[in-house]
């Protein structure tokens, strides 16, 4: 016999959940154990079973869930799984904050990204700091030509994808150019879109030909004789 | 051609049930966000929901949370909008909109294609 | 919520002649990525909304250049610089900037 225990305690390790007003919410609380525990939920310590709530609830107990579509402000709260047997009981604690707040278009840091200058043969980093309160995508761009023109017949810029990324709310978003070439010079984009639209703001890379060491004020002028 | 095709809409009693469904065609759907908007009849638009290009955010307007359910089965190319509890109010032209995309948009990010709407009446 | 509210209710105008419609936003549409997220549609009888300006002034794909759209941060115009038979119907202004989006009341333009 063995009392319960987490079976994948590392899926429960994200205690706080912030979610908008009408997302769905799943908690879920692996476990195991001889007999085979049993679960329930408690809403802020009192039985839960979602009569009270629009939609109601589902209970998965052989994937040990508690489901909640369309969560709204009066679902905030702590909800508790119990899972016991014979042996003994164990409970894991979730928060349920419910945001209202107006998802907006993402916004992004002013000034970033910021043009740059560097010299072939270095490392750049472009970065971009975006604001969302919907998860946003990010993608970096760079303005390409094509058969000699910046610009299609539409009137709107070529474009290279660079990059693709999902990323957490307020995060800074960095782009990588190793080595750079004088090809790299150029417009690059931070375009970062969420479910209510996209923003984008663009910089300059400024790439500089290698510096002549036979001329470089800097540098002993032994050094670079043959 | 890029294409929306609402159905769905009809006659119900206030406090049924009604799933309208958008079937989407000539754009990659998967990439874009999807709106319903709706238009009581004589009146004006109001937007109803947003669902992102992956499902993953949701959001309502106030007088629908709660009641309506949106969601999308990219595989199908198809929008769904599942309303319970339905009122009287909630009559209305029901319609599908092409919402943001994910690359760089080469014109408007999203709003730019509309179906042709299906009508919802709750009455008793 | 951004409260759009447009003038006039109705508007009946002579073939050849300018139109003006005009749409306040309760906050500033303008986005911190320089646009402005305002958008006008144009509503024929027993037709879906079609859209003529997007991002406060630019005019989407087969829309004719009589139509445009101007304004700045809470205050925007909708102008028809000679108005035709076939642009008769209900305009609305729309706000793109955050959820709930909301339009204007409508505006009914019809011809002398």
């Known amino acids: 016999q063995q009392a319960p225990y987490w079976t994948h305690p590392q899926r429960m390790e994200k205690k706080l959940h912030a979610v908008p007003a009408g997302n769905t919410v799943k908690f879920r609380c692996p476990a195991a154990g001889n007999p085979t525990p049993t679960i329930r939920w408690l809403k802020d310590g009192q039985a839960f079973h979602g009569e009270n709530r629009i939609g109601g609830i589902r209970l998965r107990h052989q994937h040990w869930s508690l489901v909640m579509e369309s969560v709204v402000p009066s679902d905030r709260g702590t909800y508790t799984c119990l899972v016991e047997n014979a042996v003994g009981s164990i409970r894991y604690n979730y928060l349920l904050d419910v945001l209202e707040r107006s998802p907006h278009r993402p916004i992004l840091q002013a000034g970033l990204p910021a043009n740059t200058t560097a010299v072939v043969g270095s490392d750049v980093e472009l970065l971009c700091k975006v604001y969302s309160d919907a998860q946003p995508h990010i993608q970096w761009l760079k303005h390409i030509v094509i058969n000699g023109s910046s610009f299609g017949a539409d009137g709107f810029p070529y474009v290279q994808v660079l990059k693709t990324a999902d990323i957490n709310s307020s995060e800074v978003e960095v782009l990588y150019l190793r080595n750079v070439s004088a090809e790299d010079a150029g417009e690059y984009t931070c375009l970062a879109g969420n479910s209510i639209g996209l923003s984008y703001q663009s910089a300059w890379l400024t790439v500089l030909p290698e510096e002549d060491p036979t001329w470089t004020a800097a540098a002993p002028e032994a050094r670079y004789t043959d | 051609e890029v294409q929306l095709l609402e159905s769905g809409g009809g006659v119900v009693q206030p406090g049924r049930s009604l799933r309208l469904s958008c079937a989407a065609s000539?754009?990659?759907?998967?990439?874009?966000?999807m709106h319903w908007v709706r238009q009581a009849p004589g009146k004006g638009l109001e937007w109803v929901a947003v669902?992102?290009?992956?499902?993953?955010?949701?959001y309502y307007a106030d007088s629908v949370k709660g009641r309506f359910t949106i969601s999308r089965d990219n595989s199908k190319n198809t929008l769904s909008l599942q309303m319970n509890s339905l009122r009287v109010e909630d009559t209305a032209i029901y319609y599908c909109?092409?919402?943001?995309?994910?690359?760089?948009?080469?014109?408007?990010?999203?709003?730019?294609?509309w179906g042709q709407g299906t009508m919802v009446t709750v009455s008793s | 919520d951004i409260v759009m509210t447009q003038t006039p209710l109705s508007l009946s105008v002579t073939p050849g002649q300018p139109a003006s419609i005009s749409c306040t936003s309760s906050?500033?549409?303008?986005?911190?990525?320089?646009?402005?997220?305002v958008y006008w549609y144009v509503q024929k009888s027993g037709q879906p909304p079609q859209l003529l300006i997007y991002?406060?002034?630019n005019r989407f794909s087969g829309v004719p250049d009589r139509f445009s759209g101007s304004g700045s941060r809470t205050d925007f115009t909708l102008k028809i610089s000679r108005v035709e038979a076939e642009d008769v119907g209900v305009y609305y202004c729309?706000?793109?900037?955050?959820?709930?989006?909301?339009f204007g009341g409508g505006t009914k333009v019809e011809i002398k």
């Open positions: 000539g754009f990659t759907f998967s990439s874009y966000a």
């Open positions: 909109v092409r919402g943001a995309g994910r690359g760089y948009p080469h014109g408007p990010d999203g709003f730019d294609i």
């Open positions: 906050r500033s549409l303008l986005h911190s990525d320089g646009k402005t997220y």
């Open positions: 729309m706000q793109y900037i955050e959820a709930p989006l909301t």
């Open positions: 669902i992102s290009y992956d499902g993953s955010n949701k």
């Open positions: 991002e406060l002034s």
